[in-house]
């Protein structure tokens, strides 16, 4: 988790002097509770936005927006703590809006936004906005949270972001798999424009089951430049196991930008359709 570019972050708006500070996620008001605390944020909204760094890279960011309730507690509102928790790693990043002037009611509802938390493809985050000072131990909570799921690199808008392109999102191998005679599979896919090796991972399963009955790995050496964007054809020999008929073919590239952590593409071959009622085999041959 990180912030997009550490350039001056702004939270001031007409009628309010405000500065954005790094935060330890442990506001002082936890340790030294105050008697009077503000109410919770209203209408917390999160959207996925895209922002360019100063270097021109494009990153997905969480756009966080909320409004204030129209009650007198805004007189005691000193700022807000924004927290983003990545759920699969438990990593947390916080910033603090510090109000340098007192808020006053005005003709429209106060609204705040922040769009600098960089998020990763296919990750889930808990986004929390805490009004400051935080409540006394038994006080009503004055925060709002939402669990936000970021689309993966298959998503059309995500595909062109720097983290997705680095993991090979622009490569479309257009995999085709056909079953040949004599227990063989013919796998065909389009090579990318990089001299790097690939790996084909074959996993076979029985018709209706999910535990594998056959696994095989096939190495494809790095193509020469004249082979870039050409089709690569590979014939894989299967184990002659009755009923081991559903095959998943996965192609793993090893691009220089992602090494052994590149996006993999897969295709599946289903078992051949079984007739509902098999034709009975006669145990005698009629003579007429």
């Amino acid at each position: 988790l990180r912030l997009l570019d550490h350039r001056a972050l702004v939270c001031s708006q007409p009628g309010l002097n405000c500065t954005v500070k790094n935060s330890t996620c442990l506001d002082d008001s936890w340790i030294h509770p105050r008697n009077l605390t503000p109410s919770s944020p209203k209408d917390l909204q999160i959207q996925l936005h895209f922002a360019h760094t100063q270097q021109g890279d494009l990153f997905p960011v969480a756009h966080i927006e909320w409004t204030l309730q129209t009650d007198a507690s805004i007189l005691y509102l000193e700022g807000a703590e924004l927290s983003v928790l990545q759920l699969n790693t438990n990593e947390r990043l916080c910033v603090r809006f510090e109000f340098l002037s007192k808020l006053r009611h005005h003709h429209r509802r106060w609204r705040f936004t922040f769009s600098h938390f960089v998020v990763d493809p296919d990750q889930e985050y808990e986004v929390t906005v805490h009004h400051l000072p935080k409540p006394i131990p038994d006080g009503d909570p004055n925060h709002q949270s939402k669990n936000f799921l970021v689309p993966d690199c298959e998503h059309a808008r995500m595909k062109v972001t720097t983290p997705c392109m680095s993991s090979g999102s622009l490569w479309d191998p257009n995999i085709t798999v056909e079953t040949l005679e004599a227990h063989q599979l013919r796998v065909s896919f389009t090579l990318w424009n990089e001299s790097t090796h690939y790996q084909i991972l074959l996993t076979s399963f029985p018709h209706m089951e999910n535990h594998s009955c056959f696994e095989h790995m096939h190495h494809i050496p790095a193509p020469r430049p004249e082979e870039f964007h050409q089709r690569s054809n590979v014939t894989l020999t299967l184990r002659n196991l009755k009923g081991c008929c559903r095959h998943q073919v996965q192609i793993q590239p090893f691009f220089s930008s992602c090494l052994n952590d590149c996006l993999r593409h897969s295709a599946t071959v289903s078992c051949p359709e079984m007739p509902d009622t098999p034709e009975p085999i006669p145990d005698y041959m009629p003579l007429w």
Partner: nanobody, 126 residues
Amino acid sequence: QVQLVESGGGLVQPGRSLRLSCAASGFTFDDYAMHWVRQGPGKGLEWVSGISWNGGTIDYADSVKGRFTISRDNAKNSLYLQMNSLRPEDTALYYCAKEEGLGFCRGGSCSTFDYWGQGTLVTVSS
């Protein structure tokens, strides 16, 4: 322009099933999370279920969990709600709604629903 058209509602007996459909047009359907929201007679709007852009993540309101199944077919620009074991309290006008922003939030919308269908009426009564 964006259009969401629901269908499949009707009168059904308690314990029976119904399948709602929502046909979407005028936007890139597979970019956005989609939701079902209902409004019972004399009640407010209640979020029912949501599904992420590719169908990979799904969430339900506690009141319908285990009975309703949301799904989508991006090739057909369609959203579905399979409703089983229907109860009288499921009687409502069911709306299909589009998430305004990209991304998906559990327990409802991340931001707001910027487009709604006209609704399809489901009546559960014996």
